[in-house]
């Protein structure tokens, strides 16, 4: 009765358990009773990242500059190229096939987390006591000016988009 299963680094072919090819190599010919599996290294622009029986290696990913992509890590025979986005851009998906500009936080919102090559800007509404009057991908909400520390009084209350306006204290006449 021929085998129906093989060990993990083997594969079943013609009632035989043959050795899989190591990462970085592709299958040229299956084993026989008397010859081992024949494998060949992937070429410079290709890779295979698992023990395999593939007859073709996979092409390395191309980081297309027209899509805002650049190489983060060059591929090897065992690993794919890793792309990232140019400055000011981030990936649209986990596989990073294209890039879009980082979003800016509108007035009334500040930057909670600055964007990276793989994640967009995270904005948060400015809480009471803070404001942002600019559209920015970097600026956090800033605290309202403290009039008291300048020996001034609030003449105009602040909002999430504007700072308070300070003015001199009214002097009472004798």
């Amino acid at each position: 009765e021929p085998p129906t299963a093989c060990r993990e680094k083997q594969y079943l072919i013609n009632s035989q358990c043959c050795s899989l090819c190591q990462p970085g190599q592709k299958l040229v010919s299956d084993c026989t009773e008397f010859t081992e599996t024949e494998c060949l290294p992937c070429s410079e622009s290709e890779f295979l990242d698992t023990w395999n029986r593939e007859t073709r290696c996979h092409q390395h990913k191309y980081c297309d500059p027209n899509l805002g992509l650049q190489v983060q890590q060059k591929g090897t025979s065992e690993t794919d190229t890793i792309c990232t986005c140019e400055e000011g851009l981030h990936c649209t998906s986990e596989s990073c096939e294209s890039c879009v500009p980082h979003r800016s936080c509108l007035p009334g919102f500040g930057v909670k987390q600055i964007a990276t090559g793989v994640s967009d800007t995270i904005c948060e509404p400015c809480p009471v006591g803070f404001f942002s009057n600019v559209s920015s991908a970097f600026e956090k909400c800033r605290p309202w000016t403290s009039c008291e520390t300048k020996d001034l009084v609030v003449q105009q209350a602040g909002t999430n988009k504007t700072d308070v306006v300070c003015g001199p204290q009214d002097r009472q006449r004798a």
Partner: antibody
Framework: EVQLLESGGGLVRPGGSLRLSCAAS????????MNWVRQAPGKGLEWVSY????????DYADSVKGRFTVSRDNSKNLLYLQMNSLRAEDTAVYYC????????????????????WGQGTMVTVSS | DIQLTQSPSSLTASVGDRVTITCRSS??????LAWYQQKPGKPPKLLIY???SLEGGVPSRFSGSGSGTDFTLTISSLQPEDFATYYC?????????FGQGTKLEIK
């Protein structure tokens, strides 16, 4: 220290059942394929069963197929052999053994061997 | 199933002797063969894997050769601790099988 320790052996009547356990320590159990091998008194070694690292693939010697079931619990580092419909000819010392894949990246193909064995547990099937 | 036949079944030799044990497979198994040493009351110990690769910590007096159907285990100069039973095993395909063993005794 890398170790395997079998337990659960004993005397059982023909037709009875027994569950053997093998506790692994000193290595990442869930990364290794495992085997049960037995040795009848005064006889040679007989491979009994195999289980892949995930437990997805199993295989058995013809002499135990349909009666024995191998399983594993990687969270507890335990290997099991459930033995049903036991016969007198199942009397043996039962060893659990670790399958290892030896591989040198400069070489063409790797090779398997059983590099770690337990001390064994005796199973006697008798009326 | 693949059958493995070891010869001789038993062998008497002296310390310092060169000893060869053979293992023949009923079908080609390339180099998917391992050799084990077993002493009474103890589990087997892996000596050779892949027909000719020495397991770590095994003395260099042990060597393995062969491919396809014919394999040999050689002990170049027997030491007192080498008297034991030796088994070959094919790991080419399931069911995995062992040879019947070769008992090496002191003369």
């Amino acid at each position: 220290e890398v170790q395997l320790l079998e337990s659960g052996g004993g005397l059982v009547r023909p037709g009875g059942s027994l569950r053997l356990s093998c506790a692994a320590s000193g290595f990442t159990f869930g990364s290794y394929e495992m085997n049960w091998v037995r040795q009848a008194p005064g006889k040679g070694l007989e491979w009994v069963s195999y289980i892949s690292s995930s437990g997805e693939t199993t295989d058995y010697a013809d002499s135990v197929k349909g009666r024995f079931t191998v399983s594993r619990d990687n969270s507890k580092n335990l290997l099991y052999l459930q033995m049903n419909s036991l016969r007198a000819e199942d009397t043996a010392v039962y060893y659990c053994a670790r399958d290892v894949f030896f591989f040198d990246s400069s070489g063409d193909n790797g090779a398997y061997g059983m590099d770690v064995w337990g001390q064994g547990t005796m199973v006697t099937v008798s009326s | 199933d693949i059958q493995l036949t070891q010869s001789p079944s038993s062998l008497t030799a002296s310390v310092g002797d060169r000893v060869t044990i053979t293992c023949r497979s009923s079908q080609g198994i390339r180099s998917s063969l391992a050799w084990y040493q077993q002493k009474p009351g103890k589990p087997p110990k892996l000596l050779i894997y892949g027909a000719s690769s020495l397991e770590g910590g095994v003395p260099s007096r042990f060597s393995g050769s062969g491919s396809g159907t014919d394999f040999t285990l050689t002990i170049s100069s027997l030491q007192p601790e080498d008297f034991a039973t030796y088994y070959c095993q094919q790991l080419n395909s399931f069911p995995s099988t062992f040879g019947q063993g070769t008992k090496l005794e002191i003369k």
